[in-house]
Interface confidence: low
């Protein structure tokens, strides 16, 4: 291993080195050769390298005291080298107006203290984007803030006080966007023990989809450190960052439609929220809106979704039909109606789990019903969950990545629909793919609202 | 116990019709697929039809498609095979059959189920078969 | 359609005998094949599907295997209530027929 010759370190922090270096950098300890005390180049040497120059250290190579001072500082959770959600290039909200829920909160402030250091921290990333938060305190949130201690459900365990204080998730459904924070830590409004603002400001900035900074003087760089509150700012990388997914706060053309206007059925930009075959109609769902395309036909009608269904709420987000039932399942957040020959059924809604989706499922992006072989695909985030129908049961095995089983599709989709006996129709943002699944492969690419002769 | 017992069969004029019967015991229909299974003499199995009865889906043969028609009456719990327009190359001892699916376990199915199919179409229980006679 | 080529169509062996029996799919088929035991006036017996995990019941002796769109039957010690007819027979959600069987091998005393 390649020790500095002037330092003598204990086993101890070379086990620790390489156990920073494998949760930070993406080193694989399995792939290091067994006599590691001759080990001379390359894998170790490259991601200490990598750490020294991505946090601003010289870079050595070495493990020297600077480095193991650094792997010892105070740290967010969330790895430099992104296998974490794969935050960069990865997901944004695909809105503009995002909800936050404080899950449960830490004995070592005031409740009030909490809500400000969190609203502050959440307006600090309004302010230089056209985002608008709003904290909500029953039901599904876009961000769930969480304090917790140790392994606690998510496949990364914090590690008692000091070292990791805290972790976000990328957005998405379930589990995407939240921030846990450790709550070994002690957490406070100033300066002692560790100040909550100034980390959920950093772990807010992953729950929009950000990853870490190399600059020193970025909130989203790795590792604490306590500015004054009072005059802290983000820096222009940050800005640069989060402006690069969101747009300035004046640009507001990707907001959602307000709710009283008709989406223009020809924009390019069109998206839908959920699509899915009721015999031999399309309904295509958008905000309080659907389309209703009869097959062969060219014209189309649109109407409020209240006036087919009072009881059912706007925004629609996933659906799909089993047509030998006269059944069509309709999705939002956690919750699900089901429409019995074009009429909504009694006793619903009901929760999305029932159908065996894990807790931290909170919503269905799409959903399509196979009548090949009675088996329908929940698309949830990057993933997807296989359903059978007739035993009312999850398939084992789920759930898969999107993209390593439709190949093309993904790695997140708006909407789908089968058709045709052969083909599924894939929806992302304003782009539509004619999928053929005995083929296993993408046959036609079209836009969105190709299927109204725009 | 699983028992499939098939009725129905016997000699027919070409161009006459017959209907077979599968009464199932020991299990629910509705939810399993079934299938017909027709053996000429002397000659190898051919798959005739499938359903699943709770959605009443079906699956033919080309050579019976738009004669025949497999339907089931979960009620009675049976499965039932119309076959009109009947020719000399339909005589066979027709077996009715359930899908293994319904049967396996569920930690069975965790090794077995693959990305796009789970374990299809794969026959357990079979009737002592009924012969049908289609001559002159 | 898919076909399945099973060979040989007859053979001749001992109690004793490692008997194996060959079904070639015309396409693949992933690992969706069974094979089934049939004596004469008697339905059909399942004793392997996906390709190789055993039914319930059934001897050890028997075993399936793929290699490719090749698949196995082998009956490692053959006994004599294992003269019969044997049958491959594919299937799958996404072929038109589902399901196809091979034309038998006949396992005859030697």
């Known amino acids: 291993l390649p020790l500095n010759s002037s330092t003598s370190l204990e086993k101890n922090n070379v086990l620790f080195g390489e156990r920073y270096l494998e949760k930070f950098y993406g080193l694989e300890i399995n792939k290091l050769p067994v006599t590691k005390m001759k080990y001379s180049g390359n894998l170790m040497k490259e991601k200490i390298q990598e750490m020294q120059h991505f946090l601003g250290l010289k870079v050595t190579g070495q493990l020297d005291t600077s480095t193991l001072e650094m792997m010892h500082a105070p740290r967010c959770g969330v790895p430099d080298v992104h296998h974490f959600r794969e935050m960069p290039g990865g997901p944004v909200w695909r809105k503009h107006y995002i909800t936050y829920r404080i899950n449960n909160y830490t004995p070592d402030m005031n409740r009030e203290d909490v809500d400000y250091a969190i609203r502050k921290a959440f307006q600090v990333w309004s302010n230089v984007t056209p985002l608008k938060f709003s904290k909500i305190n029953t039901g599904m949130a876009d961000i769930l803030v969480v304090f917790a201690r140790g392994a606690h459900g998510d496949f990364h365990a914090f590690d008692g006080k000091g070292g990791i204080l805290a972790h976000a998730f990328g957005p998405g459904s379930g589990i995407g966007g939240d921030a846990h924070f450790d709550e070994d830590e002690f957490w406070t409004t100033h300066s002692g023990g560790t100040n909550l603002f100034l980390t959920a400001v950093h772990e807010i900035g992953h729950s929009l989809g950000l990853g870490h900074s190399s600059d020193p003087k970025a909130v989203m760089f790795p590792t604490y450190k306590y500015v004054d509150i009072n005059t802290f700012r983000l820096s222009a990388d940050d800005i640069r960052g989060i402006q690069s997914l969101y747009g300035d706060p004046k640009e507001n053309q990707r907001l959602p439609n307000p709710d009283n206007s008709e989406p223009a059925l020809c924009d390019p930009n069109l998206s839908f929220d959920a699509v899915t075959t009721v015999g031999n109609k399309i309904f295509f769902f958008k905000d309080r809106f659907f389309w209703l395309k009869v097959s062969e036909r060219p014209k189309t009608s649109v109407n409020l979704i209240s006036s087919l269904w009072p009881t059912l709420p706007s925004g629609i987000e996933a659906a799909y039909e089993i047509e030998a039932r006269n059944q069509v399942f309709l999705f939002k957040d956690d919750k699900y109606w089901l429409i019995s020959n074009l009429r909504p059924e009694p006793n619903y809604p009901k929760s999305i789990h029932s159908f065996g989706f894990p807790n931290f499922v909170k919503k269905i992006d799409a959903a399509v019903f196979n009548p090949r072989f009675y088996r329908t695909y929940f698309f949830v985030d990057n993933q997807y969950w296989r359903y059978d129908e007739r035993r009312q049961m999850m398939d084992p095995g789920y759930p898969k990545l999107i993209t390593k089983n439709f190949q093309g599709i993904g790695p997140k989709i708006d909407a789908v629909f089968y058709s045709k006996n052969k083909y599924y129709y894939f929806f992302q943002g304003s782009n539509q793919f004619e999928y053929d699944f005995l083929l296993q492969r993408i046959t036609k690419t079209l836009k969105s609202n190709s299927w109204f002769g725009c | 116990e699983v028992q499939l017992v098939e009725s129905g069969g016997g000699l027919v004029q070409p161009g006459g019709s017959l209907r077979l019967s599968c009464a199932a015991s020991?299990?629910?229909?509705?939810?399993?697929?079934m299938h017909w299974v027709r053996q000429a003499p002397g000659k190898g199995l051919e798959w005739v039809a499938s359903i699943y009865p709770s959605y009443g889906s079906t699956y033919y043969a080309d050579s019976v498609k738009g004669r025949f028609t497999i339907s089931a009456d979960t009620s009675k719990n049976t499965a039932y095979l119309q076959m009109n327009s009947l020719r000399a190359e339909d005589t066979a001892v027709y077996y009715c059959?359930?899908?293994?699916?319904?049967?396996?376990?569920?930690?069975?199915?965790?090794?077995?189920?693959?990305?796009?199919?789970?374990?299809?179409?794969?026959?357990?229980?079979w009737g002592q078969g009924t012969l049908v006679t289609v001559s002159s | 359609d898919i076909q399945m080529t099973q060979s040989p169509s007859s053979l001749s062996a001992s109690v004793g005998d490692r008997v194996t029996i060959t079904c070639r799919a015309s396409q693949s088929v992933s690992s969706a094949v069974a094979w089934y035991q049939q004596k004469p006036g008697k339905a059909p017996k399942l004793l392997i599907y996906s390709a190789s995990s055993l039914y319930s019941g059934v001897p050890s002796r028997f075993s399936g295997s793929r290699s490719g769109t090749d698949f196995t039957l082998t009956i490692s010690s053959l006994q004599p209530e294992d003269f019969a007819t044997y049958y491959c027979q594919q299937s799958s959600h996404y072929a038109s027929p589902p399901i196809t069987f091979g034309q038998g091998t006949k396992v005859e005393i030697k």
């Open positions: 020991g299990f629910n229909l509705s939810y399993s697929y």
């Open positions: 059959a359930r899908d293994l699916e319904e049967s396996l376990p569920k930690r069975a199915r965790t090794a077995v189920s693959k990305e796009l199919e789970s374990v299809p179409y794969v026959m357990d229980y």
